[in-house]
């Protein structure tokens, strides 16, 4: 069969499975005169043979693990032994079969993990090798945890990356591992070839002993610090410690105070830097952060609580320079005249702010001293000895000592003796008739003036009139303000009127004095008046139950998922139709009848969260009035953005020739949400062929170093592919390219002859 098994001498490649005994020839080369014989050279390993007439064959089974490619040469010789054709390259590629089992590099591994370590962050790698071809399933290894000992409540605390053998904590392991309860664990790990997918796969097992170490990165107990400390500052008040040396500590003031009186040193000791004042601020909450040498957080921040303890550094203060009370001439002994309420800025309900009251002087002392007494702790003044007579002494002045346990303050009280309250207020008319108002009448409007008179002593509590609505306004829509000079009452609207709930209100007013009436006198019908408020209907817009509706969903919810709902009611009871306004991204639709909101397109937190749209409720029929409310959709992050380079890295160059291996640093980012800790990317070369020339090493969660492995580079541009994995759930990987130019340099810059090429690299390494 010319072409497949025979033909002229030319470069050829053949693929043969390893482990198979020879069953047929490889190829029959045809000689062209003057050629008379064929000769085979190269990596024959005494397996490959060519007959003089050009028959190429092999004489025993091949082994890919010994040699995966045999590079042979075939030459055609004339009768004298001179090569007249060739030598041409003949390549034999040995195809892999699964004839090697995976083997762990160690029969036992030991490692340690700190409690509360980040889930998914590897703390140990197990490693197995398989001599079979890693580009085929035969050499593709699959790691699994066979058993975890002990296993508590059937919960796995550890997980393994099936491909890399990286062992890390699960979410439960991060939360629950505790060296005090269980300081060590044992895992049995298996490795299978065939990617773990075949019944015919080979396997091996190893044992992993794991020690759980204490996480000392813990929030300290709340601190109490006495205010106004006179000790030299700064004063150490507490401490935090990262698990390993070399962390950089800082404090974060979440409250953004104008004065933040705390600091932290590089040991993690926390200090108060100046005296505190409890009356200015009685407690502080701030955060301690530990970062690595590149400024990346090593873990979550710790919350530090400082409570400021009170000392008695504030005296009592009087409510006003002079406190005025009234007492009627005929009041009985023991009657309350009024209560003096002094203040103390020290901590409430402590001895530092507990006040005592004592009368230290009464003037005039007529007809005698000691006419008044004050309750020691309550500050209530009472009539102590007898009724008072206005014509004898119309006014008394008291000096009252108010004290806490360390300070004393004098307060002044003026007591006016007034005429007895033996006259009741009398309304000038008992019925103020009907008043018709539209339901949209403005709040604050005066809708009625009422008037009562009182014959008692003018400008005293006996003649002052207070108006109360005692019936017909349970919603508190109306109020009455009194003019203190004329005792005129002004009825005002305090809350919106509502035809739908109160079309007619029968209002009753009562007029009364702040001073009590004398014994035997009572308020009667003269102190009451009424009026009827009639509210007319105004077609009102629908009313939403909330100004802002908020919902929270994961950004990867399926299209058609209900993401929230809104509700509105029409005051007139009409049906409502809902619609959306401002859905600029076309993500949502609303059910016109129910107000339920659904997704109609893929959501994307990175495009902006919360996503704000307006919802409109419109009356169906009537005058089609509408109202608008806000709908805020908070999108929770899922790991849906692969890592990428943080900036443009065109223009990287090394001066050629390299005098020593060089390196450059690059930064990765992605658009997903990273809370306190920031991203934790891992970096690797994008293809195996790059490993001879380049090496990539992680610096921290976002930065890596690309280094040359040697100095023998050509003077040209190399495109280095880097694989960046975000370790998320699910993990996403980005392949980025770093273009690196090796060029002749003049004064540290790339030299390009005139008219050469544009895009001159600008960053030398």
């Amino acid at each position: 069969q010319e072409g497949k098994f025979s033909g002229p001498l030319k470069p050829m490649t053949f693929s043969i499975y390893e482990g198979q005994e020879p069953s047929q020839i490889i190829f029959q080369f045809k000689a062209n005169p003057p050629a008379v014989t064929f000769e085979l050279t190269g990596e024959t390993d005494n397996i490959f043979v060519i007959e003089r007439e050009g028959l190429l064959y092999y004489n025993r089974a091949l082994d890919r693990e010994t040699r995966s490619t045999h590079n042979l040469q075939v030459a055609a010789l004339d009768a004298n032994g001179i090569i007249v054709e060739g030598p041409v390259p003949i390549t034999i590629k040995v195809k892999d079969i699964n004839d090697n089992r995976p083997t762990f590099l160690q029969s036992k591994y030991e490692g340690s993990v700190r409690q509360n370590s980040r889930p998914g962050k590897p703390f140990l790698y197990v490693n197995a090798t398989d001599l079979d071809d890693p580009a085929t399933p035969n050499g593709q290894l699959y790691y699994q945890i066979v058993i975890q000992l002990p296993m508590i409540n059937n919960v796995m605390y550890f997980q393994i990356n099936n491909k890399t053998g990286a062992i890390s904590l699960t979410r439960e392991g991060s939360q629950e591992l505790n060296p005090a309860k269980n300081p060590s664990y044992n895992l049995v790990i298996s490795v299978k070839d065939m990617g773990g997918q075949s019944e015919n796969s080979f396997s091996d097992t190893t044992s992993v002993d794991i020690i759980v170490t204490e996480n000392i990165w813990k929030a300290p107990k709340p601190v109490e610090m006495v205010e106004n400390s006179t000790d030299p500052h700064p004063i150490k008040i507490t401490q935090v410690r990262w698990n390993d040396p070399g962390a950089q500590y800082s404090l974060v003031d979440k409250e953004k105070l104008p004065r933040f009186p705390f600091s932290i040193d590089q040991e993690g000791d926390i200090y108060v830097t100046q005296p505190l004042d409890r009356e200015e601020k009685d407690a502080y909450v701030f955060y301690a952060v530990a970062k690595d040498e590149y400024g990346k957080p090593l873990s979550y921040p710790l919350e530090i609580h400082v409570k400021v303890k009170d000392i008695n550094d504030n005296p009592p203060t009087c409510p006003s320079p002079v406190t005025v009370f009234e007492v009627q001439e005929n009041e009985r002994l023991g009657n309350s005249i009024g209560t003096l309420t002094a203040h103390d800025r020290d901590e409430e309900n402590t001895a530092n702010s507990f006040l005592n009251y004592r009368i230290v002087e009464q003037t005039p002392k007529l007809p005698m001293d000691g006419l008044f007494l004050i309750q020691t702790y309550a500050g209530m003044l009472q009539l102590a000895k007898q009724s008072l007579k206005k014509q004898d002494t119309p006014q008394y002045n008291l000096t009252i000592e108010v004290s806490d346990k360390d300070f004393k303050t004098l307060c002044f009280v003026q007591i006016n003796v007034i005429d007895i309250n033996d006259q009741i207020p009398i309304f000038e008319k008992s019925d103020y008739g009907n008043l018709t108002l539209a339901e949209d009448t403005n709040i604050g409007s005066t809708i009625l003036t009422i008037q009562a008179t009182d014959a008692d002593e003018p400008f005293t509590g006996s003649s002052k009139i207070l108006y109360h609505i005692i019936k017909g306004d349970s919603e508190g829509r109306l109020g009455v303000d009194t003019d203190p000079h004329t005792n005129t009452g002004y009825v005002i609207i305090k809350k919106p009127l509502d035809f739908e709930t109160a079309a007619v209100s029968n209002i009753v007013f009562k007029a009364e004095n702040p001073e009590p009436l004398v014994f035997g006198v009572k308020y009667n019908a003269s102190s009451f008046a009424k009026f009827t408020l009639i509210v007319t209907d105004v077609n009102e817009a629908p009313q939403f139950s909330q100004h802002v509706f908020q919902a929270k969903v994961s950004e990867d919810v399926a299209i058609g998922t209900k993401v929230g709902n809104v509700t509105a009611k029409d005051p007139e009871g009409l049906d409502i139709s809902y619609s959306l306004r401002g859905d600029t991204r076309g993500w949502l639709k609303i059910d016109h009848v129910t107000g339920e909101i659904f997704s109609v397109a893929p959501l994307d937190r990175e495009a902006g969260s919360p996503y704000r749209v307006q919802v409109v409720a419109t009356e169906v029929g009537g005058s089609s009035l509408s109202s608008v409310s806000e709908f805020h959709l908070i999108l929770m992050d899922v790991n849906d953005n692969p890592p990428r380079l943080a900036k443009d890295y065109t223009g990287l160059f090394f001066c050629h020739p390299l005098s020593a291996p060089g390196s450059l640093i690059f930064e990765a980012t992605d658009d997903d949400q990273h809370l306190f800790r920031g991203p934790h990317f891992t970096f690797s070369l994008g293809s195996g062929s790059l490993q001879n020339d380049w090496e990539v090493s992680k610096i921290n969660g976002t930065h890596a170093r690309l280094s040359t492995r040697h100095t023998e580079f050509e003077e040209r541009e190399y495109v280095v592919l880097i694989r960046i994995n975000d370790g998320g759930r699910p993990p996403l990987e980005g392949i980025v390219s770093l273009p690196v130019t090796f060029c002749s340099c003049v004064e540290g810059s790339c030299f390009r002859p005139a008219g050469h090429q544009t895009g001159i690299p600008t960053v030398g390494m």
Epitope: T37, E39, T41, G42, A75, L77, A79, N80, G81, I82, I83, V84, E85, G86, P87
Partner: nanobody, 115 residues
């Protein structure tokens, strides 16, 4: 992989003798025509002598009667016996298998004839 390794070169006075050897590997030595070539500084490579697979020999005029080429197929080795050496014989001597056009070459050995 075919390898040809020359040895036996060196410094010799005019009228002296040297024996060059060429050890071959990675090939069926007996099937190839073998030869010695030389290249003096600033000059082109030239044939000194060759021996075909049947044992027939061939010499350049400038060395006839002074140089002898031979082969030992059992030892996969080619030889060149050089007598009555002259200063103009100074050159790098190369072993060849399969002819100058398409064949295999060794790395060469230096022969210097000088008083």
């Amino acid at each position: 992989e075919v390898q040809l390794v020359e040895s036996g070169g060196g410094l010799v006075q005019p009228g002296g003798s040297l024996r060059l050897s060429c050890a071959a590997s990675g090939m069926r030595f007996s099937q190839y025509a073998m030869g010695w070539y030389r290249q003096a500084p600033g000059k082109q490579r030239e044939l000194v002598a060759n021996i075909f697979k049947d044992g027939t020999t061939n010499y350049a005029d400038s060395v006839k009667g002074r140089f002898t080429i031979s082969r030992d197929n059992a030892k996969n080795t080619l030889y060149l016996q050089m007598n009555s050496l002259r200063p103009e014989d100074t050159a790098v001597y190369y072993c060849n298998a399969g002819g100058a056009a398409l064949g295999y070459w060794g790395q060469g050995t230096q022969v210097t004839v000088s008083s």
